[in-house]
Interface confidence: medium
């Protein structure tokens, strides 16, 4: 199709070679044709529409991304081209930042029901660069953790070095919402609650003498409890002692609750105690068998192919830990009669 | 007992000024509500004027009409909540309740005042 | 700012009668969304917060549905004490705060 008279749209993607981060291309069409399938509320009722209102389906997915390449080939589908790249709804979804990621990307309606409909579409001419040089030390992060029920805040990265007063007016999206009334390089949560959880985007204008660039970064936004101010306790096993059949294998499984830390390095391993002696044992990894905001339960087995005499001498003791503390607990093997 | 009261309604000319003050009692000020000013036009509806929260944030949130004309302000160490009217209209007459919304989930107004007549008029 | 529609502006019903109120949000607001009770003379009443929650101490004939844009207030069986005027509110504030609006109200009044 004949992308002349597609709307055009310039951004900029400065990305950090430090960390990960991801990046959204919007399907900005015009209004009114956008709210007939994306129901996305997001150019002010003062925005004229640029073309006639596009006459499309209500599928939230009913758009088609494309890219131009640069050679002049034929516009190609994103979906069949570009793993890296994703689309959700109305959104692309960048998954990893690279200037191979630079170019004009095309969002259409996939179904094309008036004559009017065929201008119904943007071209975005995406930059990508990284950051040259380190000028803002502390810029924010692509990755920011609210507290529950704390007040706290999300920064634009690319705007975090500015002061309020320096910074020109943002644009924020909350997972691909507009935010209307916020303004500022940084918004304000007086008290965060799960809902503030979500990927942020944050928009200004860039101009030169020749053009203007918008200017978009990415935030992806937790919502955490505090950090856990106890040791890790051990669920199982709760006995200290465990019977068992002589030559048949044995499963022991220790299962120990994790407090939430930011910095998350939890250790949990089992060990043998024989007499004086204690070795470490190479036993399956751990694995999380249940994750909630507050806490991990984290476990781990020792397996045994065949239970020995020497093994009813044996202690089998768990060791869990975290930043704060460890603890254990020993489990000895006894015969199991009749 | 839980209570707001509302006081400062007063006749005023039209371009005057009044300042609404709502003194609370029961609860504490620094705890983390939304205190907002809800106005409502004799025989019409409720209206939004304003809201602060009285978290560390102290954010402020206008209804767009007020923005300019009104200012929303609090004083934690009398527990005492503040609407500062300015350059008032004839529209402006109207009840002005105080109300404390929760500060989770979108804060609903579980307390309200019993209002404060404002009349503009020459 | 948000506007909230609500309908009917005022309704006529009988004790028993089963009651329903809309109210219409221009843009999302999720489930943040309240609905009071008003008496002549007396402040608002909450009975029901984040749109379907209803509030300790008001009668289980109150009940609310709805999210996003589209809400709804029920009275399964309307009582003597009923007849009031009903207003809907966005409740959203921080982040997702558009405007702590309210609808225009419905009046219930007795046929």
């Known amino acids: 199709f004949n992308i002349s008279g597609c709307s055009t749209k310039k951004l900029l993607w400065t990305y950090s070679t430090r960390s990960e981060e991801e990046f959204v291309l919007f399907c900005d069409l015009p209004e009114p044709q956008k709210s007939h399938f994306c129901h996305r509320n997001r150019l002010s009722p003062k925005q004229v529409p640029e073309h006639l209102p596009f006459m499309g389906s209500n599928d939230l997915s009913d758009v088609q991304w494309y890219q131009q390449p640069s050679n002049g080939d034929p516009l190609e589908d994103i979906r069949k081209s570009y793993p890296h790249i994703i689309q959700d709804k109305c959104t692309l979804h960048f998954l990893t930042p690279g200037v191979n990621n630079s170019g004009s990307y095309i969002c259409r309606p996939k179904m094309i029901k008036s004559p009017y409909d065929v201008a119904c579409c943007v071209k975005m001419i995406l930059e990508v660069k990284p950051q040259t040089n380190a000028s803002c030390e502390y810029s924010a992060s692509h990755k920011q953790d609210l507290l529950l029920g704390s007040t706290g805040s999300i920064s634009c990265p690319s705007l975090s070095c500015q002061s309020d007063a320096q910074s020109p007016a943002v644009t924020w999206y909350k997972n691909g919402k507009l935010l209307s009334v916020e303004r500022s390089n940084r918004i304000v949560v007086d008290e965060v609650y799960d809902y503030h959880q979500g990927t942020y985007v944050c928009d200004y204008t860039q101009s030169d003498t020749v053009s203007s660039w918008t200017v978009r970064a990415v935030v992806q936004v937790r919502t955490i409890v505090g950090d856990t101010k106890l040791k890790p306790d051990i669920l199982d096993p709760v006995e200290d002692t465990l019977e068992v059949e002589l030559g048949k294998p044995l499963t022991i499984s220790c299962k120990a609750r994790f407090g939430f830390e930011r910095v998350f390095n939890p250790v949990i391993k089992w060990y043998i105690k024989d007499s004086d002696l204690e070795w470490e044992v190479s036993v399956p990894e751990a694995k999380s068998i249940k994750s909630t905001l507050k806490d991990e339960i984290i476990e781990r087995n020792i397996i045994l192919e065949k239970v020995t005499q020497r093994d009813l001498r044996r202690k089998f003791v768990c060791f869990v830990q975290n930043s704060i503390g460890n603890t254990t607990q020993s489990v000895q093997l006894k015969e199991k009669r009749g | 007992e839980v209570q707001l009261e509302e006081s400062g309604g007063d006749l005023v000319q039209p371009g005057g000024s009044l300042r609404l003050s709502c003194a609370a009692s029961?609860?504490?000020?620094?705890?983390?509500?939304?205190m907002c000013w809800v106005r409502q036009a004799p025989g019409k509806g409720l209206e939004w004027v304003a809201c602060i929260y009285t978290g560390s944030s102290g954010s402020t949130y206008y209804a767009s009409w007020a923005k300019g004309r009104f200012t929303i302000s609090k004083d934690t160490s009398k527990n005492t909540l503040y609407l500062q009217m300015n350059s008032l209209r004839a529209e402006d007459t109207a009840v002005y309740f105080c109300?404390?919304?929760?500060?989770?989930?979108?804060?609903?107004?579980?307390?309200w005042g019993q209002g404060t007549l404002v009349t503009v008029s020459s | 700012d948000i506007q909230m529609t609500q309908s009917p502006s005022s309704l006529s019903a009988s004790v028993g009668d089963r009651v329903t109120i809309t109210c219409q949000a221009t843009?999302?607001?999720?489930?943040?969304l309240a609905w009071y009770q008003q008496k002549p003379g007396q402040a608002p009443k909450l009975l029901i917060y984040r749109a379907s929650t209803l509030e300790s101490g008001v009668p289980s004939r109150f009940s609310g549905s709805g999210s996003g844009t589209d809400f709804t207030l029920t009275i399964s069986s309307l009582q003597p004490e009923d007849f009031a005027t009903y207003y809907c509110?966005?409740?959203?504030?921080?982040?997702?705060?558009?405007?702590?609006?309210f609808g225009g109200g419905t009046k219930v009044v007795i046929k």
């Open positions: 509110q966005c409740t959203v504030y921080g982040v997702n705060f558009v405007a702590n609006a």
């Open positions: 843009e999302d607001i999720e489930s943040f």
């Open positions: 109300a404390r919304g929760a500060g989770s989930y979108g804060g609903a107004v579980r307390l």
């Open positions: 029961g609860f504490d000020f620094s705890s983390n509500y939304y």
